[in-house]
């Protein structure tokens, strides 16, 4: 039997019911909050064999291994995870061992085993035989080993019945309990599983099988399985379902969903039944099962009831994430707001079309309408009283419309209306007449000449720079000094900077009224000397980062012709120039041989330019004189080699500290501090675990229904 | 915890009409897949039909295709199945069940069930 989609078993222990007949959990399954400690011994699901997804536990009181529960789970898939992980195992206070000794495979994913006072044998369990990379696999903040003393079957009795492998440099037997060994097949089987007596399973099979070579024995499919059989692909008119099985045309028309999404069913994409269309395709009309691919943006077609949708806030332009087409009439008004510009975009930026008209009033947060940053039609449909299908009226901070260089707006119908917008200077209006199309059909007094702009420096001179230099952080520039009529009037510059990958940003980029800012700004004052250019030294940059610069006066407002003179620059583009790469992370080296080495790295964090070349170094060590003196031949404990694992737990750490001759004297010598770099790796890690913390309580606390 | 409680269950003669209903507590009533089942004596539990959260789709088993409607009624948390044209190989133990996210076809593990009610189709 087959239970999903997806099994979430909390608060009450006897919901664990619900697993009795499945063999497949299409899916995840989640068992946790459950805090009263309770009895699990008579509870057994010996007919689970498979989850597709990943496996939660979180806070079960009382459960002390997870070997009774599921004493034949084989495989976990993997297919969708839970923050990367396909097995977490979070503050478990009870649990005493994992005893999942059938489990051989974890396809995809890694696991996370952490915060588990009670926990043992996590070090007798090798992980490597059952996923593929071991490097992502978080386990810490458990029972320390040297509490557990783990110890596998036969090992007191002398006649240990466990296989041994290799771990971090340590050969030693591999088992999940006290009389649970870890399952290895024959290396004539490779990548192959194997049955209960070693033999090998047919190759399209996982995890383990009922009888040798046989693909219609598998516990498990290792690609895809169709009327009883494991195959590496889909037979013809059948299709891939989440991740594991092959249905017809059929079923896929017939799944039902709970979201409300689902009044179109399912679709068959690229061999595949599926929810939705992937992202980038759309459904091939409206009661189609098949997707083609969308031209630009996909269309989302967004309705207001009301047919006017009032913008006041982030949450309400929240309801418009994803909106290509607006169905209905935009007003905004928004009076305050936190990083209010990059927020609207954000929920607001996909929006092409309004189908009525767009109202901006009393919006006295923003500084430009950039934030529509892919509007190109207003239709009109719908017009305020006077035929108006753009209305802007008194938005104090309001300086720019659009970028109208790289904007292409069409106004179908209606007329465009301005007025008490002191800093939106009219030419930039004249702009958007001529742009949007509407030039003419406004009346005299739509756009009024005397209270838009009249607190802006609308005749911009433009200043330009005379010099750059750059350093690996640092980058110089002048410019021309600027003269307007009346030398008083020159106050004192602004430079505005920012890192720009792309040659795309404008002045009003994450811009907002109420202090928001994308870019950083430095004041420099006028030289005294009148014959020196001005300029400034930005320090404190990243190494071969590209940075947008403008520069901007600041003069009186000098009202001439009821309007301010102000000068700016254009903005520049300059990249800072290479530097040293930061180091090479996560470098691993082992021996596949007498005489071979392998080592791997990733590239370093901070690249600090265009990385040509890796150079390695190596020399010769002499042998560890440490190894000659133990006897190997004698029954005492061969004692363990300490590796640094990256993840030493501080509990964990409970030797004295050295006693030797410091500065003269004999004495404890105190433990050398932390470097800057082990530091800020303790810093990570515990913002790491937090990270995950709060996706695992975001994800699973979940409001009682009314 | 889901509860599902069934009613409108009796005796009819064949030809004639029976509206179930099932009254649900304790959850989202639209975020479940809902589902008919039905068990006649001596028989093995049989999927009579389903209906998606937003009531916009449903299927059915083809013994009942034409003759019964499934429908829901999310304001009123409750699901309902219309039989007409009943016949006496209806006569069964009637169950909703109720399926958080998804159903697929043939899918018998519901995550909740009702306890039945008894529909007699007899003259």
């Known amino acids: 039997e087959i239970c999903g989609p997806g099994i979430d078993i909390r608060n009450d222990y006897q919901q664990l019911k619900r697993l009795e007949n499945c063999t497949v959990i299409e899916g995840y399954l989640h068992i946790l909050l459950i805090s009263k400690a309770e009895d699990y011994r008579s509870y057994r699901f010996p007919k689970l064999t498979v989850i597709t997804e990943y496996l939660l536990l979180f806070r079960v009181a009382g459960l002390e291994s997870l070997g009774d529960l599921f004493p034949n789970l084989t495989v976990i898939r993997g297919w969708k995870l839970f923050y990367n992980y396909a097995l977490v195992i979070f503050e478990m206070t009870n649990l005493k061992d994992i005893g999942l000794y059938n489990l051989r495979n974890i396809t995809r994913g890694a696991i996370r085993i952490e915060k588990n006072a009670d926990l043992c044998y996590l070090s007798t369990v090798d992980w490597s035989l059952i996923l593929d990379a071991v490097s992502n696999n978080y386990i810490v903040g458990n029972k320390p080993p040297k509490e557990c003393g783990d110890l596998c079957p036969g090992t007191m009795e002398e006649k240990p019945m466990c296989e041994k492998t290799t771990i971090n440099n340590e050969y030693n037997y591999r088992c999940w309990t006290t009389n649970r060994c870890q399952k290895m097949c024959p290396s004539t089987c490779g990548k192959r599983a194997c049955t209960e007596n070693n033999e090998c399973c047919h190759p399209e099979c996982l995890g383990s099988c009922s009888a040798p070579d046989n693909d219609t024995a598998c516990v498990a499919c290792r690609h895809y399985y169709y009327a009883g059989v494991c195959v590496p692909a889909c037979p013809p008119n059948t299709y891939r379902f989440e991740g594991w099985r092959c249905v017809d045309r059929d079923f896929c028309a017939n799944i039902l969903s709970a979201e409300s999404s689902d009044s179109e069913g399912f679709v068959i994409h690229d061999g595949e039944c599926m929810q939705e269309c992937p992202s980038g395709f759309i459904r091939n009309g409206s009661q189609s099962m098949y997707c083609i691919p969308c031209e630009g943006p996909c269309p989302k077609v967004c309705e207001e009831e009301k047919k006017t949708k009032t913008i006041d806030s982030v949450t309400s332009a929240q309801m418009l994430q994803g909106c290509t087409i607006f169905k209905g009439n935009l007003l905004i008004n928004i009076r305050r707001g936190n990083n209010i510009a990059s927020e609207l975009e954000n929920f607001m930026g996909l929006i092409e079309v309004v189908t009525g008209y767009v109202k901006i009033r009393h919006s006295h947060a923003l500084v430009s309408l950039s934030f529509l940053k892919n509007l190109r039609l207003i239709l009109g449909e719908e017009q305020l009283e006077g035929n108006y299908s753009f209305y802007v009226l008194d938005n104090q901070n309001l300086q720019q419309l659009w970028d109208w260089d790289h904007r292409n707006l069409t106004i179908k119908a209606g007329k465009m209306y301005f007025a008490f917008n002191p800093k939106l200077c009219v030419s930039e209006i004249y702009r958007m007449e001529e742009v949007t199309g509407t030039k003419g059909r406004q009346s005299k007094g739509d756009i009024n000449t005397r209270n838009n702009g009249e607190r802006a420096s609308c005749e911009s001179d433009v200043l330009h720079f005379t010099s750059t230099t750059t350093s690996k952080n640092r980058i110089i520039i002048t410019w021309h000094r600027y003269r307007p009529p009346d030398y008083r009037d020159l106050i004192s510059f602004t430079v505005y900077y920012k890192e720009a990958p792309f040659k795309n940003v404008t002045e009003y980029d994450g811009q907002d009224a109420c202090g928001s800012n994308s870019w950083n700004m430095v004041d420099v004052d006028l030289p005294p000397n009148k014959d020196v250019e001005p300029g400034i030294l930005l320090h404190g940059l990243k190494p071969w980062t590209q940075y947008a610069v403008y520069v901007k006066a600041v003069t009186l407002t000098m009202v001439e012709n009821d309007h301010i003179r102000g000068a700016k620059s254009e903005i520049l583009y300059i990249r800072t120039n290479a530097s040293v790469p930061s180091i090479p992370l996560d470098v691993l080296s082992a021996s596949n041989s007498s005489s071979q080495l392998i080592v791997k790295w990733n590239p370093p964090s901070l690249p600090n330019g265009n990385l040509s070349y890796y150079i390695v170094r190596w020399q010769r060590q002499p042998q560890d004189g440490y190894l000659y003196r133990h006897n190997y031949c004698s029954k005492d404990k061969i004692p363990i080699r300490k590796y640094a694992d990256g993840t030493i737990d501080i509990e964990e750490v409970t030797e004295n500290p050295k006693t030797e001759v410091c500065g003269g004297e004999k004495g404890p010598c105190c433990a050398c501090p932390k470097t800057e770099a082990e530091k800020q790796a303790e810093k990570e890690e515990a913002e790491y675990r937090k990270v995950f913390e709060n996706f695992l309580h975001n994800s699973i606390f979940v409001p009682r229904p009314e | 915890e889901v509860q599902l409680v069934e009613s409108g269950g009796g005796l009819v003669q064949p030809g004639g009409s029976l509206r179930l209903s099932c009254a649900a507590s304790?959850?989202?009533?639209?975020?479940?897949?809902m589902s008919w089942f039905r068990q006649a004596p001596g028989k093995e539990r049989e999927f009579v039909s389903a209906i998606s959260g937003s009531g916009s789709r449903a299927y059915y088993a083809d013994s009942v295709k034409g003759r019964f409607t499934i429908s829901r009624d999310n304001s009123k948390n409750t699901l309902y199945l219309q039989m007409n044209s009943l016949r006496a190989e209806d006569t069964a133990v009637y169950y909703c069940?109720?399926?958080?996210?998804?159903?697929?076809?043939?899918?018998?593990?519901?995550?909740?069930w009702g306890q039945g009610t008894l529909v007699t189709v007899s003259s």
């Open positions: 304790g959850g989202t009533f639209s975020s479940f897949v």
């Open positions: 069940a109720a399926n958080p996210r998804r159903a697929t076809p043939g899918f018998t593990q519901y995550a909740y």
